[in-house]
């Protein structure tokens, strides 16, 4: 379970049309459910239930985004559909280049993600918790444009990694 170094860049536009970027660094773990690879893309927050569309003819997103899923407490979920492995797979099927799970409220998801090694996804599946998860969700919940870059080695300078 290697460390995943995640950089999140938030784009804040000003009334003049310019924008400012804010870079936040956080760490997670690569799970055995996916590959230990670098990945980058615009963040799309995915509601856990939204991943379980009963209709198989669902719309696909454009390829190359990073899905962020905040997992709920499993005991009280009224309609559990996909397991956490299923959620990761569905996100990748729908075009995610990586998936990041906030497991703070569902720590048992860590074991589930690390049991899924028989047929791992070819894209990274990362989990975050605690202060790192709070930082990530604070950015995601702003509902502004943000990009994430996931690496398996510490980043050098943030400016090296984003083509603005």
């Amino acid at each position: 379970k290697e460390t995943a170094f995640v950089e999140v860049v938030l784009f804040e536009s000003s009334p003049s049309g310019d924008y400012t970027t804010y870079t936040t660094g956080l760490t997670g773990r690569f799970s055995r459910a996916g590959a230990t690879l670098s990945a980058e893309g615009e963040i799309v927050q995915m509601h856990p239930l939204g991943l379980c569309n009963n209709n198989d003819e669902e719309d696909l997103y454009e390829y190359g985004w990073v899905g962020v899923v905040k997992l709920e407490q499993p005991e009280l979920d009224p309609k559990p559909c996909l397991t956490v492995l299923g959620k990761a797979k569905r996100a990748v099927q729908r075009g995610a280049t990586a998936v990041i799970f906030d497991v703070s409220e569902n720590p048992e998801a860590i074991d589930q993600l690390n049991q899924g090694s028989e047929d791992p996804l070819k894209r990274p599946v990362v989990y975050v918790k605690g202060a790192d998860a709070i930082k990530l969700m604070n950015i995601v919940n702003k509902q502004k444009v943000a990009r994430a870059r996931i690496q398996h080695r510490p980043p050098r300078q943030p400016t090296e990694y984003f083509d603005m």
Epitope: P74, K79, P80, C81, T83, G86, E108
Partner: antibody
Framework: EVLLQQSGAELVRPGSSVKISCKTS????????LHWVKQRPEQGLVWIGR????????VCIEKFKTKATLTADKSSNTAYMELSSLTSEDTATYFC???????WGQGTLVTVSS | DIQMTQSPSSLPASLGERVTISCRAS??????LNWYQQKPDGTIKPLIY???NLQSGVPSRFSGSGSGTDYSLTIGSLEPEDFTMYYC?????????FGAGTKLELK
């Protein structure tokens, strides 16, 4: 094609136990929760509980916590429900259904009679 | 637990007729309402999820609507195979609960 194939009807004695199976195919077993639903003769549907096939963790409603034991066998893609201390109240058809309740088994009739 | 009240319990109707089945929740369920059809042989077929979304393969004569606590299933023009049982189900809060069912009968 997603299929949930349940075991056949059972005639059992009061006080005994019965274990019914739900063999799945057409999808990755560990990707979806598996749910169980009860239907008594000429009555409505009651959700019993669910199992996560990855780790075997279960959640059941209070009424079934001591009555039903849910298990899953990843090697055969099969889920099981064992019902214990059977009474006439347990005479019913039991359905397994995949997470999202979009695919259902054909049902297993359990008749409790002496 | 949220109680689901379906009405009517029995609904006599004719071929080609348009019918509506109602389902009321004991508290708001924010559109988390599904409809199922149960055939005479016991087979259960999902029809509609999240109030108004048709499952794959379900004929377009079926439609769902509603909000808050009140929801309905409408069948536009009844076909012979439609005369069977229908159930609503909420999955807004744990545990998921079903209505008692509506039997659609040939008049």
């Amino acid at each position: 094609e997603v299929l949930l194939q349940q075991s056949g009807a059972e005639l059992v004695r009061p006080g005994s136990s019965v274990k019914i199976s739900c063999k799945t195919s057409g999808y990755t077993f560990t990707d979806y929760y598996l749910h169980w639903v009860k239907q008594r003769p000429e009555q409505g549907l009651v959700w019993i509980g669910r199992i996560n096939p990855i780790n075997g963790k279960t959640v059941c409603i209070e009424k079934f916590k001591t009555k039903a034991t849910l298990t899953a066998d990843k090697s055969s893609n099969t889920a099981y429900m064992e019902l214990s201390s059977l009474t006439s109240e347990d005479t019913a058809t039991y359905f397994c259904t995949r997470g999202g309740l979009a695919y259902w088994g054909q049902g297993t009739l359990v008749t409790v009679s002496s | 637990d949220i109680q689901m009240t379906q009405s009517p319990s029995s609904l006599p109707a004719s071929l080609g007729e348009r019918v509506t089945i109602s389902c009321r929740a004991s508290q708001g369920i924010s559109n988390n309402l599904n409809w199922y059809q149960q055939k005479p042989d016991g087979t259960i077929k999902p029809l509609i999820y999240y109030t108004s979304n048709l499952q794959s393969g379900v004929p377009s004569r079926f439609s769902g609507s509603g909000s808050g606590t009140d929801y309905s299933l409408t069948i536009g023009s009844l076909e012979p195979e439609d005369f069977t049982m229908y159930y609503c189900q909420q999955d807004a809060s744990f545990p998921p609960t079903f209505g008692a069912g509506t039997k659609l009968e040939l008049k």
